[in-house]
């Protein structure tokens, strides 16, 4: 039954209202059942097939063949002490598109997750001649032209507007009913925003001629990448080495990654320059920086900014 009290429909399409005490109505067939409409100045006007050639009344259903802009208003079904009310808003069809933007159902699907669109219309099923499925108003060539279906694992290319168009005949006239879905494909929402652990800026006290290991750790996703930037464009420094990344899986199925930058035989050229560790993900990048300072210069920098 049509339980929603507020309904928006597009002009020119078949439409129906079905009251929610239908089984009860069959039990007491002798009971008077009435449909009313009120709009603007007009108070309850009883509807009957003579009201309009576009209206059909059945026990449970009020049908429009098709619904038009002037059908906007409030509708009532009355039977004994049972009343049901709907507010109907009929909107203009978009003449320049295969669908009307205001009549679109939005769905978000995660990439790789199961994605399905099935073109079905149970109420008009027996009257439907054929059904077509369009993506962004271009017809998709699918095998089943009675109930076209898409069933697949979602890819980013699947994003778009999918319109099911049912073609049906009634009293010698051809009608169509359109149902459109706006499908948005999003990143796997189980992904985390990767985070580099520890302070963003680290001063490391070192001695010339000695070695130092700068450890960069992050919590990240399996496909994310962690790497060091250390000015290798100005000729590769043979004393600087990125070590092998180490990964440990967390109980949540994410990764704790660690990548060490090893600087051997520290020279003046290694002091007071930025060694940046970056984690890159589909959501962007995060960077933390290390600066090597001579132990003799430690007094110039507040103690809390040092790392070992």
């Amino acid at each position: 039954c049509t339980s929603r009290p507020h309904i928006t429909v597009v002009e020119g399409e078949p439409f129906y209202l079905k009251h929610c005490s239908c089984s009860l109505a069959h039990e007491i067939e002798t009971t008077t059942k009435s449909w009313y409409k009120s709009s603007g100045s007009q108070e309850h006007v009883e509807l009957n097939p003579r009201s309009s050639s576009r209206i059909a009344l059945h026990d449970c259903v009020l049908e429009f063949w098709p619904v038009e802009l002037n059908d906007t208003g409030s509708y009532f079904f009355q039977m004994k002490n049972y009343t049901q009310k709907w507010k109907l808003n009929v909107i203009r069809r978009n003449k320049h598109s295969c669908f009307t933007e205001r009549q679109v159902t939005s769905k978000i699907v995660e990439v790789k997750k199961f994605f399905q669109i099935t073109c079905e219309n149970s109420y008009y099923q027996t009257l439907v001649n054929s059904t077509s499925l369009y993506k962004n108003c271009k017809k998709l060539l699918l095998e089943n032209n009675k109930n076209p279906t898409i069933k697949k694992n979602a890819e980013f290319e699947d994003q778009g507007y999918y319109s099911c168009v049912h073609f049906l005949h009634h009293n010698g006239k051809l009608f169509n009913i359109t149902k459109t879905f706006n499908i948005t494909i999003v990143e796997d929402r189980s992904n985390i925003v990767p985070v580099l652990l520890g302070p963003k800026l680290n001063h490391v006290a070192v001695e010339l001629g000695k070695n130092v290991r700068l450890n960069c750790s992050a919590l990240l996703n399996e496909e994310d990448v962690i790497y060091w930037m250390f000015g290798e464009e100005n000729g590769s420094d043979p004393n600087i080495h990125e070590e092998k990344e180490m990964r440990i899986m967390t109980p949540e199925g994410k990764w704790h990654a660690s990548k060490v930058l090893r600087i051997e035989n520290i020279g003046e050229s290694n002091l007071n320059v930025l060694y940046n560790c970056t984690v890159a993900s589909t959501g962007g990048t995060d960077t933390k920086s290390f600066i090597l300072v001579r132990k003799a210069d430690m007094a110039d920098i507040p103690g809390h900014v040092f790392t070992r």
Partner: antibody, heavy 122, light 107 residues
Framework: EVQLVESGGGVVQPGRSLRLSCAAS????????MHWVRQAPGKGLEWVAV????????YYSDSVKGRFTISRDNSKNTLYLQMNSLRAEDTAVYYC???????????????WGQGTTVTVSS | SSELTQDPAVSVALGQTVRITCQGD??????ASWYQQKPGQAPVLVIS???NRPSGIPDRFSGSSSGNTASLTITGAQAEDEADYYC??????????FGGGTKLTVL
């Protein structure tokens, strides 16, 4: 049309140099990491090098490190591989390939060129 | 070791299911990708690093992973699936490594 077109291959003597180019079209070149992969005659695929989308980061296989340099010019939508000190074992078809993700370092390369042949022989 | 190991050759009857495997330590921490290469042609990505099929790849191709082993499964192999198949993954050195390749014959 989305495509990669390699050029610059040829026959070269051991110890000499060669520069390969890869012209990209049909996608936002500056948004992706780019790779060079080679295939010696009758052998499998061997990864050579990768460069980040902005060109700031590069990695090389151990077999070419110090001899080959990967670079890119995003204004020209072109990827390069400068090959110095060439050896007979560098003989192969060289493919450029595009990473499939906005994460520049990925093993999923979803667009490949047709390849250019490099023969190192005296 | 950062190497990826594949069986050199595998055969399958037309319409049957075949599984091509790839083993290596890097697969414990990084996704595997799979490529199809036919003679005289460039490789084509068939399964991406998140076990996703790129557009145009039939749904008979699927990927899975467990421990240090990645698998490519072709359900209902067709004659046109006869090709060399390569696995690949990143490793801890931020390099990409390829497996040695598997030659698939469809009987």
């Amino acid at each position: 049309e989305v495509q990669l077109v390699e050029s610059g291959g040829g026959v070269v003597q051991p110890g000499r140099s060669l520069r390969l180019s890869c012209a990209a079209s049909g996608f936002t070149f500056s948004g992706y990491g780019m790779h060079w992969v080679r295939q010696a005659p009758g052998k499998g695929l061997e990864w050579v090098a990768v460069i980040s989308n902005d060109g700031s980061k590069k990695y090389y296989s151990d077999s070419v490190k110090g001899r080959f340099t990967i670079s890119r010019d995003n204004s020209k939508n072109t990827l390069y591989l400068q090959m110095n000190s060439l050896r007979a074992e560098d003989t192969a078809v060289y493919y450029c390939a595009k990473g499939s993700s906005s994460i520049w370092l990925t093993s999923a390369l979803n667009l490949w060129g047709q390849g250019t042949t490099v023969t190192v022989s005296s | 070791s950062s190497e990826l190991t594949q069986d050199p050759a595998v055969s399958v009857a037309l319409g049957q299911t075949v599984r091509i495997t790839c083993q290596g330590d890097s697969l414990r921490s990084y996704y595997a990708s799979w490529y199809q290469q036919k003679p005289g042609q460039a490789p084509v990505l068939v399964i991406s690093a998140k076990n996703n099929r790129p557009s145009g790849i039939p749904d008979r191709f699927s990927g899975s992973s467990s421990g240090n082993t990645a698998s490519l499964t072709i359900t209902g192999a067709q004659a046109e699936d006869e090709a060399d198949y390569y696995c690949a993954s990143r490793n801890g050195w931020n390099h990409v490594v390829f497996g040695g390749g598997t030659k698939l014959t469809v009987l």
